[in-house]
């Protein structure tokens, strides 16, 4: 939570004189109450918008937009306090409209807004804006609050922003996933446009549950220049247990701008359709052998193996 | 001293009701987001539920949603939690904390106990 | 939802042996990793934030590791004090899920 620094933000506007402060947000009228204090906001609205940094970096910014009331209490209005509280970390930040001149009614309904509050994706934030100064401690609060769901790199706008670049979003593996036989599963997906390694991690499943009964991860090396955008398919083999026949495959990539916290990709296959009368398991014979604690992987070499190729 | 001191607890029989609260001294509680965190005898932490500074975001775990509502009252420093239609699973000593700036959750109060029991 | 898994669920280690928890969520969480001691009786006291900052007071011997799925919580040297149930919670987004525990005890 930061905010953009170019170009500077501005609260001037026709018929009133204006600057944005930094603020600890703290208004002094908390500490110094005032006997007549202003209304709260009107129609708070607060909706994605991207801007660019002065490096050319393109981030989503929360714009804030909001109205006076007409009544009376504008006269006493002497600015706005803006605050977002990432819900998560609650981490806050703020910044302060400080008018320089009074407020007057005329012929248009007074509206500021606010674009410099850079958000991250795939996260919530709580955008009040109170009214200055605020109200004594028995008054009618004057702020409003909105909750502001910021999209994750998976939405169309929010792919091209800088830090989703940096996570891996223009990246799209375009997964296929094929079940060759009861033991064999072939993955194919597109390689990346960087010499970097990936890895396949299976996890496997009862027809209806969520507890995994198979587990296995594979490692691909590293791709060579000419197999950049190329497709790689890889044959997993399946540890032959009844019943853990759901499938899903998530491919992990490791690139230079984000390590191992890369977005992944997953794709998932379905227990094939059941006969209408199914086969008699016998009594007591587990589906697959329970295990405890740990719910590690097991790497190439453990009950599972695999080899892939790269396609030109 | 930053301090939370929940209280509300008790017994209660299955589909009963009952209201917790969660009194904040020390700190500035309307600068603060608040959770609910439950702890089933002899089992793990379980996140309960999550109310912003003003209000204005509110969240529940699955277990709980449609039967608990979280509220508080910035004036009085408190934090509630109103649970309706009562199971036997809900039985725990209920915590309330405090996000730490940065992430976690590192004020939390002593616990109140609440048993559902016919 | 994402899910958290810890391993081991429970260890027996000597005093001042190196003892190493691990957590793994579901799906990236990115650093937004916490972890929690919780001794018999008492409120869980926060350990690390952000997957490896040490919270304020926590002795150095604590520390924390990891990113995106797989973290870890390291104790340098074991000490007596140290037994307790330790919690790794996810808080990317809500539901801000706790890891099952991992009790720790003393040889």
């Known amino acids: 939570l930061r905010l953009l620094d170019f170009p500077a933000p501005v609260c001037a506007q026709e018929g009133l004189s204006c600057r944005v402060k930094n603020s600890t947000c703290l208004d002094d009228s908390w500490i110094h109450p005032r006997n007549l204090t202003p209304s709260s906001p009107k129609d708070l609205q607060i909706q994605l918008h991207f801007a660019h940094t002065q490096q050319g970096d393109l981030f989503p910014v929360a714009h804030i937009e909001w109205t006076l009331q007409t009544d009376a209490s504008i006269l006493y209005l002497e600015g706005a306090e803006l605050s977002v509280l990432q819900l998560n970390t609650n981490e806050r930040l703020c910044v302060r409209f400080e008018f320089l001149s009074k407020l007057r009614h005329h012929h248009r309904r007074w509206r500021f807004t606010f674009s410099h509050f850079v958000v991250d994706p795939d996260q919530e934030y709580e955008v009040t804006v109170h009214h200055l100064p605020k109200p004594i401690p028995d008054g009618d609060p004057n702020h409003q609050s909105k909750n502001f769901l910021v999209p994750d790199c998976e939405h169309a706008r929010m792919k091209v922003t800088t830090p989703c670049m940096s996570s891996g979003s223009l990246w799209d593996p375009n997964i296929t996933v094929e079940t060759l036989d009861t033991q064999h599963l072939r993955v194919d997906f597109t390689l990346w446009n960087e010499s970097t390694h990936y890895q396949i991690l299976l996890t496997s499943f009862p027809h209806m549950e969520n507890h995994s009964c198979f587990e296995h991860m594979h490692h691909i090396p590293a791709p060579r220049p000419e197999e950049f955008h190329q497709r790689s398919n890889v044959t997993l083999t399946l540890r032959n247990l009844k019943g853990c026949c759901r499938h899903q495959v998530q491919i992990q990539p490791f690139f230079s701008s984000c390590l191992n916290d890369c977005l992944r990709h997953s794709a998932t296959v379905s227990c094939p359709e059941m006969p209408d009368t199914p086969e008699p398991i016998p009594d007591y014979m587990p589906l697959w052998e329970p295990r405890s604690g740990s719910s590690d992987y097991k790497d190439d070499d453990d009950k599972g193996s695999s080899h892939h190729h790269h396609h030109h | 001293e930053v301090q939370l001191v929940e209280s509300g607890g008790g017994s209660v029989q299955p589909g009963g009701s009952l209201r917790l609260s969660c009194a904040a001294s020390g700190f500035t509680f309307s600068s603060y987001s608040m959770n609910w965190v439950r702890q089933a005898p002899g089992k793990g932490l379980e996140w309960v539920s999550i109310i912003s500074s003003r209000s204005s975001i509110i969240h529940y775990a699955d277990s709980v949603k449609g039967r608990f509502t979280i509220s508080r009252d910035n004036a009085k420093n408190s934090l509630y939690l109103q649970m309706n239609s009562l199971r036997d699973e809900d039985t725990a000593v209920y915590y309330c904390?405090?996000?730490?700036?940065?992430?976690?959750?590192?004020?939390w109060g002593q616990g109140t106990t609440v048993t559902v029991s016919s | 939802d994402i899910q958290m898994t810890q391993s081991p669920s429970s260890l027996s280690a000597s005093v001042g042996d190196r003892v190493t928890i691990t957590c793994r969520a579901s799906q990236g969480i990115s650093n937004y990793l916490a972890w929690y001691q919780q001794k018999p009786g008492k409120f869980p006291e926060l350990l690390i934030y952000?997957?490896?900052t040490l919270q304020s007071g926590v002795p150095s011997r604590f520390s924390g590791s990891g990113s995106g799925t797989d973290f870890t919580l390291t104790i340098s040297s074991l000490q007596p004090e140290d037994v307790a149930t330790y919690y790794c919670q996810k808080y990317n987004r809500a539901p801000f899920t706790f890891g099952p525990g991992t009790k720790v005890d003393i040889k």
């Open positions: 904390a405090r996000p730490k700036v940065g992430g976690g959750m590192d004020v």
């Open positions: 952000a997957a490896s």
